[in-house]
């Protein structure tokens, strides 16, 4: 995403269509306070942040209201009037989703429906990961929907389960983020848990009759 | 399976003005997810991206040509049009409809017409 | 407008041969850049999209890689049919602009 004017790198992530997030690392200028300014319409006179990110005290970023914008971001960060980088951007390649929220989990002997609240925009998939202590991975399944059916589970194991949301990569692109992940719930036995155990218990050996 | 056939091209005056048309068939126009594009090619083969309708008939153009330009569709013909004015000579080139991957307007563009030569002078 | 070089302008190889095209972008494009096939009187035909991904029916001899400004379009064994110009093309910028051809002919 960062660009070659003048050294400057760029980064842009734009956080469940609503917000966008412009960072910058300029080495040229790592004591300068660069200015941020921007329009969502080509016609438009550039408007300047007022939503600053700093980093040593010094600007490195940008945070818009993006909701309900059009699709492009034209913007120029500057040193003085001096325009620095300049560039426009389909916000959407940049597409960070929320992270999952309301999740819940539904027992059913051997398996587990997990869901949450569907994001209100589509073509997205919604991926659970799950591992028990047995596990050197995490296993994972994703879906469409958040609604998703995990089988062939042991109901005697404790298991490790998060959340997150990808936007699929045929529609988006493939330079999106994927949503952080919700947090760690633990279950056994169709019970919440506050944690499993890292190392397995060892099974008990058969007493002999 | 998508085609895509341009006509309204030939000679035009300087000044002047020209409209062309996209038929598409195989393919509705209006499916959700797929933006059209007008992309033209000048005699020494350099591409320049016009401008896109989306299926929901939002649209986009280069800031180079946007004065100058509209792009429309009729959805009961499934095709779409490029008007064009104030035309110049360096606008001679020959111009194709296309149609962008699915996910929209940001892409690639999987499908093109044979395109329309454009002839700019008096 | 993001600037999009190809290199070489033209190329002249033989059947069989491995070639390899360049374009590089003026700014970072992450891996959003699209690869076209050009013959004499058609209309241009992608190849590759997303700096790596086969278009459908598009023979495996074609691959490409790159991310951020430097990618590279590769046929690793010249077919007569492979004889064109090829073009590349980046999308996240606004608008999408393309590079100015390789002319692929026959030595």
């Known amino acids: 995403q960062g660009g070659a004017a003048e050294g400057v790198q760029i980064q842009i992530i734009y956080f469940n269509l609503e917000t966008v997030q412009v960072t910058w690392n300029a080495s040229k200028y790592s004591r300068t306070n660069l200015t941020f300014h921007y329009r969502f319409n080509g016609d438009e006179a550039y408007d300047q942040c007022t939503n600053y990110l700093l980093q040593e005290g010094h600007t490195s970023g940008c945070l818009l209201d993006a909701e309900q914008r059009d699709d492009i971001l034209y913007f120029s960060i500057r040193n003085g009037t001096h325009p620095v980088f300049t560039a426009s951007r389909w916000m959407v390649y940049y597409l960070k989703p929320s992270s999952p929220k309301h999740v819940r989990f539904s027992w059913h002997q051997d398996a587990v429906t997990v869901t949450c609240s569907d994001l209100s925009y589509g073509d997205l998939l919604y991926e659970v990961q799950y591992r028990s202590p047995f596990d050197t991975e995490w296993q994972s399944k994703q879906e469409n929907t958040c609604n998703v059916t995990i089988e062939g589970l042991d109901a005697e194991k404790c298991y490790s389960f998060w959340v997150r949301v990808k936007a699929m990569e045929d529609v988006y692109g493939p330079d999106t983020y994927p949503s952080d992940w919700s947090e760690v719930t633990c279950w056994q036995r169709g019970e919440i848990r506050d944690a499993c155990a890292e190392t397995p218990t060892p099974p008990k050996p058969k007493l002999s009759k | 399976q998508v085609q895509l056939v341009e006509s309204g091209g030939g000679l035009v005056k300087p000044g002047g003005s020209l409209r062309l048309s996209c038929a598409a068939s195989g393919f509705s126009i209006t499916t959700s997810g797929y933006y059209w594009t007008w992309i033209r090619q000048f005699p020494g083969k350099g591409l320049e991206w016009m401008g896109y309708?989306?299926?929901?008939?939002?649209?986009y153009y280069n800031p180079a040509l946007k004065s100058r330009i509209t792009i429309s569709r009729d959805n009961a013909k499934n095709s779409l049009y490029l008007q064009m004015n104030s035309l110049r000579a360096e606008d001679t080139a020959v111009y194709y409809c296309?149609?962008?991957?699915?996910?929209?307007?940001?892409?690639?563009?999987?499908?093109w017409g044979q395109g329309t030569l454009v002839t700019v002078s008096s | 407008d993001i600037q999009m070089t190809q290199s070489p302008s033209s190329l002249s190889a033989s059947v069989g041969d491995r070639v390899t095209i360049t374009c590089r972008a003026s700014?970072?494009?992450?891996?959003?850049l699209h690869w076209y096939q050009q013959k004499p009187g058609k209309a241009p035909k992608l190849l590759i999209k997303f700096a790596s991904r086969l278009q459908s029916g598009v023979p495996s001899r074609f691959s490409g890689s790159g991310s951020g400004t430097d990618f590279t379009l590769t046929i690793s064994s010249l077919q007569p049919e492979d004889f064109a110009t090829y073009y590349c093309?980046?999308?996240?910028?606004?608008?999408?602009?393309f590079g100015q051809g390789t002319k692929l002919e026959i030595k």
């Open positions: 093309q980046q999308s996240p910028g606004f608008p999408p602009t």
């Open positions: 309708i989306g299926y929901n008939s939002k649209t």
């Open positions: 700014q970072s494009i992450g891996t959003s």
């Open positions: 296309a149609r962008s991957l699915y996910g929209g307007y940001k892409d690639a563009f999987d499908s």
